[in-house]
Interface confidence: low
């Protein structure tokens, strides 16, 4: 089948990184600079993505694959394939339309991106607050007051429920 197909369509023999050049009797021509074809048999090469402005090049374009962008330091990617860059804030802040704002009391953000989230409500699990929350860190819940009755052995505080997020930069 492949052989028959290639006899009928000479373009099917053109590998990735080339295009089937109708102007040159359907021979396989290399993709021009700043363009690529990621599959064989293509009649044109696609223009490479340019990482301009706040974007910077994570992976340079080759004849067979598009460039990949990420964001310059101080910004992080949003969207599929890093279609947008959003400004980083400090831990303990969130990005609003007016820029980076501190988390309100009772909320925290342990990353340079994302929104402030409410502190864990320890009492919902029947526990007490062992370590108070801050703008940057969630509260640490400890044993319930009943567990700390006289004679009870001392308890090592549990690790926080979620591991602090690693910032993108």
């Amino acid at each position: 089948f492949e052989r028959t197909r290639s006899l009928q369509d000479p373009c099917s023999n053109c590998p990735a990184g080339t295009f089937c050049d109708n102007n040159r009797n359907q021979i396989c021509s290399p993709c021009p600079p700043n363009s690529f074809s990621s599959a064989g048999g293509q009649r044109t090469c696609d223009i490479c993505r340019q990482c301009k402005g706040v974007f910077r090049t994570r992976k340079e374009c080759s004849s067979t694959s598009n460039a990949e962008c990420d964001c310059t330091p101080g910004f992080h990617c949003l969207g599929a394939g890093c279609s947008m860059c959003e400004q980083d804030c400090k831990q303990g802040q969130e990005l609003t339309k007016k820029g980076c704002k501190d988390c309100c009391f009772g909320t925290f953000n342990d990353q340079k991106r994302g929104i402030c989230r409410p502190w864990t409500n320890c009492s919902l699990d029947g526990k007490s607050v062992l370590v108070n929350g801050t703008k940057e860190r969630d509260v640490v819940c400890g044993p319930s007051p009943a567990d700390l009755s006289p004679g009870a052995s001392s308890v090592t505080p549990p690790a926080p429920a979620r591991e602090p997020g690693h910032s993108p930069q």
Partner: antibody, heavy 117, light 112 residues
Framework: QIQLVQSGPELKKPGETVKISCKAS????????IHWVKQAPGKGLKWMGW????????AYADDFKGRFAFSLETAASTAYLQINHLRDEDTATYFC??????????WGQGTTLTVSS | DVVMTQTPLSLPVSLGDQAAISCRSS???????????LEWYLQKPGQSPKLLIY???DRFSGVPDRFSGSGSGTGFTLKISRVEAEDLGVYYC?????????FGGGTKLELK
């Protein structure tokens, strides 16, 4: 060929304002960000911040927030560094440089600023 | 901020010698995208800095192959296999992985 040409040396008094220019040629100005670097006499290089030439948005290192302002004249392919309320410690050579793929491939020749009463 | 510490401060050499400059960062320079944005620049007296090495070990166009870069994480080295007169000057390492971007303090390569 690609060039970044900066304005000439400046002699200023404390409290005055200076505006240094960096004119780019030989490439599409808005495709590459422009960064500014300070070098005090006999000292090392210090990154001041950068200008997004596509959006005109600046970003400053903490030590250069307040009295320092980056700006652009895109039609003239020129970036500017303005320093207000000059101090003695602003005496330095200031470089503009182009960022390509995250590294600085072309640099201006530097502008020497002397602040003295 | 990421602190870049270069050693030695001064490196006296004879022409033809091998030279090595070390650069340490206060935190890893591996970016979340997998790249490590560590560069080396050379500044000669009265001149602008010039790019030698980017992304740890990639030589910039026109840079002689006697210059090589290596390292990962927080430790990096620039080596010059045979020092020539035109190599003398101050070498700076630089990180572009974390905001704010930072230079090392510089290493002066000079004749003995």
């Amino acid at each position: 060929q690609i060039q970044l040409v900066q304005s000439g040396p400046e002699l200023k008094k404390p409290g005055e304002t200076v505006k240094i220019s960096c004119k780019a040629s030989g490439y599409s100005f808005t495709d590459y960000s422009i960064h500014w670097v300070k070098q005090a006499p006999g000292k090392g290089l210090k990154w001041m911040g950068w200008m997004n030439t596509e959006t005109g948005e600046p970003a400053y290192a903490d030590d250069f927030k307040g009295r320092f302002a980056f700006s652009l004249e895109t039609a003239a392919s020129t970036a500017y560094l303005q320093i207000n309320h000059l101090r003695d410690e602003d005496t330095a050579t200031y470089f503009c440089t182009r960022s390509s793929y995250g590294y600085f491939d072309y640099w201006g020749q530097g502008t020497t600023l002397t602040v003295s009463s | 901020d990421v602190v870049m510490t270069q050693t030695p401060l001064s490196l006296p050499v004879s022409l033809g010698d091998q030279a090595a400059i070390s650069c340490r960062s206060s935190q890893t320079l591996e970016h979340i995208n997998g790249n490590t944005y560590l560069e080396w620049y050379l500044q000669k007296p009265g001149q602008s800095p010039k790019l030698l090495i980017y992304k740890v070990s990639d030589r910039f166009s026109g840079v002689p192959d006697r210059f090589s870069g290596s390292g990962s994480g927080t430790g990096f080295t620039l080596k010059i296999s045979r020092v020539e007169a035109e190599d003398l000057g101050v070498y700076y390492c630089f990180q572009g992985s974390h905001f704010p971007l930072t230079f090392g303090g510089g290493t002066k390569l000079e004749l003995k």
